[in-house]
């Protein structure tokens, strides 16, 4: 369960890949599209509101082997829209929704080497937001391998 209904903290940051490509959001035909692209020098990076929540549960209840606290995050690039995992389509989408947010909008935050982070689906442990063909997608990571694969590493910068 997520401790409390309000985040412990929030921050505005731009999101980029391990290879320094920017994550951008564009309104097209009344819906938002997510792109992974090289930004022109003078173009301003899109900012995302990251809301951080504490999740507290015993491993027996969660089934993910974690027996304590985890840091959950939701990502909102524009008012009332949140990144959500579509596990059926293995895609990451922007949806307009009201609070309380659905579980698909929550991601477990992992700190990684090189000051990178990864985002693991709350609804599907072992599945992370990643980069595939210049788009964000859901990528299954084999826990027997090192989780350092570059396509699931992101950088946050204020």
């Amino acid at each position: 369960s997520i401790t409390g209904i309000s985040p412990i903290t929030e921050s505005l940051a731009s999101l980029s890949t391990y290879n320094d490509q920017s994550i951008t959001f564009a309104l097209e035909d009344e819906s938002y599209e997510i792109y992974v692209e090289d930004l022109k020098k003078d173009k301003k990076k899109d900012k995302v509101l990251l809301s951080y929540y504490e999740s507290q549960h015993p491993s027996s209840e969660s089934g993910d082997g974690v027996d304590g606290k985890m840091l959950m995050v939701t990502l909102s690039p524009t008012k009332d829209f949140w990144l959500q995992a579509n596990n059926k389509e293995h895609s990451v989408e922007l949806h307009k929704c009201e609070k309380p947010l659905p579980d698909q909008a929550f991601f477990v935050l992992h700190n990684r080497s090189f000051n990178c982070v990864s985002f693991e689906c709350k609804t599907d442990p072992g599945v992370f937001i990643g980069v595939k063909d210049n788009h964000l997608a859901l990528i299954k990571v084999d826990y027997s391998e090192n989780l350092g694969s570059e396509n699931i590493l992101f950088k946050l910068s204020e």
Epitope: I8, T9, S11, A13, Y52, E54, S59, G65, V66, D67, G68, K69, M70, L71, V108, L109, H110, N111, R112, S113, N115, E120, Y143, E145, N146, L147, G148, E158
Partner: antibody, heavy 122, light 107 residues
Framework: QVQLVQSGAEVKKPGASVKVSCKAS????????MHWVRQAPGQGLEWMGE????????SYAQKFQGRVTMTRDTSTSTVYMELSSLRSEDTAVYYC???????????????WGRGTLVTVSS | DIQMTQSPSSVSASVGDRVTITCRAS??????LAWYQQKPGKAPKLLIY???SLQSGVPSRFSGSGSGTDFTLTISSLQPEDFATYYC?????????FGGGTKVEIK
């Protein structure tokens, strides 16, 4: 309950190496990174580095790069910190510490070992 | 590396006093700041995380505030067991770095 048990005090000569162990219990070992922090006598706290017990990846403070090696043994839930080419300035208490949150160091370090005193003296 | 500057380095106070310790980061660290208490011969103890969240089991007389680069730890009414050294630590990026410490002594 969750605890970190460290190996005993060591006395080493300059130029030698020391290997300190930290045995974890009471939690899922691979879900939490392990950090090493040292404290010289009468001084403040100094972060040395971190190991991710899941894959074994490490991040070291620049100051210790090339002299420190952090490893782990998942079968015994033990993390090791080896410091080589010891000098008198390395005399300190060495702590292992676990983050408050699984997978993340953002919420601070809430479980600490009791510390291992390493004395470097000729 | 991010430098953490703590002040004052020591403070003399009496039981019941309000004590404030400040910590300044050389660059923005979002809200990722922790405060620790350390007593002689003991390991540090986490008091506050994410700038203002109280660690479980820590008395409510301890509070944290601030964001960006400037943070504060306040002890609203000092108790005998609070005489110790306090450290701030940025948890935003590697290498994690600590402030130099503030020793709270009996007046």
């Amino acid at each position: 309950q969750v605890q970190l048990v460290q190996s005993g005090a060591e006395v080493k000569k300059p130029g030698a190496s020391v290997k300190v162990s930290c045995k974890a219990s009471g939690y899922t070992f691979i879900s939490y990174g392990m950090h090493w922090v040292r404290q010289a006598p009468g001084q403040g706290l100094e972060w040395m580095g971190e190991i991710n017990p899941h894959g074994g990846s490490t991040s070291y403070a620049q100051k210790f790069q090339g002299r420190v090696t952090m490893t782990r043994d998942t079968s015994t839930s033990t993390v090791y910190m080896e410091l080589s080419s010891l000098r008198s300035e390395d005399t300190a208490v060495y702590y292992c510490a676990r983050p408050s949150a699984a997978y993340s160091h953002y919420l601070g370090l809430d479980i600490w070992g009791r510390g291992t005193l390493v004395t470097v003296s000729s | 590396d991010i430098q953490m500057t703590q002040s004052p380095s020591s403070v003399s106070a009496s039981v019941g006093d309000r004590v404030t310790i400040t910590c300044r980061a050389s660059q923005g660290i979002s809200p990722w700041l922790a405060w620790y208490q350390q007593k002689p011969g003991k390991a540090p103890k986490l008091l506050i995380y994410a700038g203002s969240s109280l660690q479980s089991g820590v008395p409510s007389r301890f509070s944290g505030s601030g964001s960006g680069t400037d943070f504060t730890l306040t002890i609203s009414s000092l108790q005998p067991e609070d005489f110790a050294t306090y450290y701030c630590q940025q948890a935003n990026v590697f290498p994690l770095t600590f402030g130099g410490g503030t020793k709270v002594e009996i007046k």
